[in-house]
């Protein structure tokens, strides 16, 4: 990940346990930019600084994630820490003058796709793997990859093998896997989004 993620992690790791708890509670009610969802309360409250950083980046991307983190820190009265975070994220890109919103920047890496956000849960909970493989065969999976996944003994190991190929996939390949999940295990997709 990029500089912004590291800066968010650095800020959150410098919070006391009590401050981190307060940060999470404020995050549940902080105003969000249009088009962004809120991290579910249940998942949020149990996270440590590292998990929370990853969640912030996956939900809000690096640029907005850093901005949102700084806003919450400022709201907690931690102006200096918020300033350090923003300074760190603008290093090398030139900060916008005070009072002027910096133009949207593309994140160092695009935000996480739904299947990347929920990788662990999908590995643990997908049962209809054969159906997924048939849906992806020839479009996303080569014959060799298809056979390699099928050869695994359990559903989790099949899914783990399938996910071993996803780093090479583009966004539309991941969308095809998500489509297959919507078609075959809709209840699971809905449940993951709620979680």
């Amino acid at each position: 990940m990029g500089r912004a993620r590291d800066a968010i992690l650095d800020a959150l790791e410098n919070l006391t346990a009590e401050e981190l708890k307060k940060f999470k509670l404020k995050l549940l009610s902080v105003p969000l930019r249009e088009g962004y969802g809120r991290i579910p309360r249940g998942a949020l409250l149990s996270m440590d600084a590292l998990d929370l950083t990853d969640k912030l980046v996956s939900f809000y991307l690096e640029t907005y994630g850093a901005e949102l983190t700084a806003n919450v820190l400022r709201d907690m009265g931690l102006q200096e820490m918020a300033g350090q975070l923003q300074a760190a994220t603008h290093q090398g890109s030139g900060a916008a003058p005070a009072g002027i919103q910096a133009p949207p920047q593309s994140a160092a890496k695009p935000g996480l796709h739904f299947i990347d956000q929920h990788r662990a849960a999908l590995i643990a909970r997908v049962t209809n793997v054969e159906w997924l493989l048939d849906a992806l065969y020839g479009k996303v999976l080569t014959d060799e990859q298809y056979q390699a996944v099928r050869a695994e003994p359990t559903n989790p190991s099949k899914m783990r093998k399938l996910f071993s190929f996803t780093p090479a996939w583009n966004w539309t390949c991941k969308d095809l896997l998500l489509q297959a999940l919507r078609e075959s295990q809709s209840y699971l997709v809905e449940d993951l989004e709620r979680s």
């Epitope: 920047q105 966004w171 390949c173 998500l178 489509q179 919507r182 993951l192």
Partner: antibody
Framework: QVQLQQSDAELVKPGASVKISCKVS????????IHWMKQRPEQGLAWIGY????????NYNDKFKGKATLTADISSSTAYMQLNSLTSEDSAVYFC???????????????WGQGTTLTVSS | DIQMNQSPSSLSASLGDTITITCHAS??????LSWYQQKPGNVPKLLIY???KLHTGVSSNFSGSGSGTGFTLTISSLQPEDIGTYYC?????????FGGGTKLEIK
Amino acid sequence: QVQLQQSDAELVKPGASVKISCKVSGYALTDHSIHWMKQRPEQGLAWIGYMYPGDGSANYNDKFKGKATLTADISSSTAYMQLNSLTSEDSAVYFCTRPYYFGSSYDYFGYWGQGTTLTVSS
Amino acid sequence: DIQMNQSPSSLSASLGDTITITCHASQNINVWLSWYQQKPGNVPKLLIYKASKLHTGVSSNFSGSGSGTGFTLTISSLQPEDIGTYYCQQGQSYPYTFGGGTKLEIK
């Protein structure tokens, strides 16, 4: 706020090509896919396909493969759709649109360009 | 491709009425359905997503229900600003497909 600004109406001759633009503001172009829709007068909407500017990948409706080509220029925050070998059947309003929520379980379109009217006539 | 059949194709109702538009998918699409409103000369506007979730800023007079193959959009207490054409759209499988539209007029 999020805005999608499309290019002006086009009048082109049969057999020609046209490139419609969709300039986005209020977010980074690379953060969301851009989808394109076709609407003919007194007819419904048809999904043409989408591209994800973050990696340049695209997914087309089979009905529009060979007809539409989707691209993007990140430096100008602009997505494009080129339509070629135009006929009167291509006369329509074309919309660019963006899913409302990043990383969602499915695409629902909360942001739309104002539409570009394409007229194909000799 | 998944076909989306919408009915009625047009309807006329009085102010204050409650009206219902239905959408039938040719195969199971679970809850992956959206509803849009398009006023004359305007762009489509998202009303409902995931079959029943009201989009932000949309009047609570609109509601959606259904799953699988049958879906309903209900508009209660019809207002003058509700005139326009309503479309359903399945978002489960590519290519995404729309219903043919329902044109709503006020009597």
